[in-house]
């Protein structure tokens, strides 16, 4: 079998809401993945599991099942959304994200994603980790090329 390539492209959008009373930030983060099938047969994307970390704390998890089938030598772009909550011991971030004196409220999040593919009864898992800047102060839609530049895509050290 040839390789199945997973490329994390970046954050597509981040939608934010707040609970002032609880000093809580809710961020719905939509990410984009490219999955390339370099084989001469179809592969099934069984599931995608994702989690988001802020300051080494997991703030959101998501799992997508039975996603799609990728044909021979084909590529598919998949969007997935991770709902995240920044609260409790990180509630000081409410002050940062709602600060009126600054325009862009970028925070650094670690995006982790694992793609499980299947072909001929065989399963394969491919994982990626990237740090991303996300604006927690407003709803933001990123151009993907811009997102790669903005989000300083680098593997975890």
């Amino acid at each position: 079998p040839r390789s199945i390539e997973v490329k994390y492209i970046g954050v597509k959008s981040a939608y934010v809401s707040y609970d002032a009373e609880k000093r809580t930030i809710y961020l719905n983060i939509t990410n984009t993945l490219n999955i390339t099938n370099n084989n001469y047969y179809s592969v099934e994307v069984e599931n995608i599991t994702a989690q988001v970390q802020f300051s080494k704390t997991v703030i959101g998890k998501a799992r997508l099942n039975n996603i799609t089938n990728i044909g021979p030598l084909d590529m598919k772009q998949i969007d997935y959304t991770v709902p995240t909550v920044i609260a409790e011991e990180m509630s000081y971030m409410y002050d940062f994200c709602t600060l009126l004196s600054i325009k862009v409220h970028n925070i650094v999040l670690m995006m982790q994603v694992t793609v499980t593919t299947a072909y001929f009864g065989h399963s394969e898992q491919i994982s990626q980790e990237r740090y991303q800047y996300v604006d927690c102060g407003r709803n933001t839609t990123y151009q993907l090329a811009q997102s790669e530049y903005l989000n300083v895509l680098q593997p975890q050290q």
């Epitope: 011991e89 000081y92 971030m93 650094v108 740090y131 800047y133 300083v152």
Partner: antibody
């Protein structure tokens, strides 16, 4: 307004211990971590450790493990720094500060510790 | 531990001039950087947080920039009250560390 009030100067003998305080006011005490720094005379700043009153999470710089201990009295919104087995190298000004994302936004006035026989 | 290399160590500048102080991190700190001013006998004061954001009450002649491992603090049209020592500090991974400081003297 936010204030961090530190205890007064200390003159202590080598081998002894000292406990200094940092009393927070003007904000919800449990929301922000409190950081501690050391500044030796005419020198730069060193981070000692931090304490988060929300969950009592304490982190230390390896260099100060066994030397520094952070404790809290939540009823008075006060964080304490205890320094043990003092030597002349511990003579310095010790600052507490409030953590904010990407910087420490409020600082105490500092506590001067002099170790001398 | 992440090392913060600050330069220059000292400089002497006339009122009205522009000054830039730089800080280099030994690895990517993702804009988790603060700049502080400290005057003789006083506590440090936050000038810039998260690399680019001006703290409350800080004059607009101060500005922070940079990303990755390279950061700078710029002071436009230097005033006499700007003398003192400036420190950068990363807050990316524990232990937080400070730069060695830049002593700014007014000519």
């Amino acid at each position: 307004q936010v204030q961090l009030q530190q205890s007064g100067a200390e003159l202590v003998k080598p081998g002894a211990s000292v406990k200094m305080s940092c009393k927070a006011s003007g904000y919800t005490f449990t929301t922000f971590p409190i950081e501690w720094m050391k500044q030796s005379h005419g020198k730069g700043l060193e981070w000692i450790g931090n304490f988060h009153p929300y969950n009592d999470d304490t982190k230390y710089n390896e260099k100060f493990k066994g030397k520094a201990t952070l404790t809290v009295d939540k009823s008075s919104s006060t964080v304490y720094l205890d320094l043990s087995r003092l030597t002349s190298d511990d003579s310095a000004v010790y600052y507490c500060a409030r953590y904010f994302y990407g910087g420490m936004d409020y600082w105490g006035q500092g506590t001067s510790v002099t170790v001398s026989s | 531990d992440i090392q913060m290399t600050q330069s220059p160590a000292s400089l002497s500048v006339s009122v009205g001039e522009t000054v830039t102080i730089t800080c280099r991190a030994s690895e990517n700190i993702y804009s988790s950087l603060g700049w502080y001013q400290q005057k003789q006998g006083e506590s440090p004061q936050l000038l810039v947080f998260a690399a680019t954001n001006l703290a409350d009450g800080v004059p607009s002649r101060f500005s922070g920039s940079g990303s990755g491992t390279q950061y700078s603090l710029k002071i436009n049209s230097l005033q006499s009250e700007d003398f003192g020592t400036y420190y950068c500090q990363h807050l990316w991974s524990i232990p937080w560390t400070f730069g060695g400081g830049t002593r700014l003297e007014i000519k």
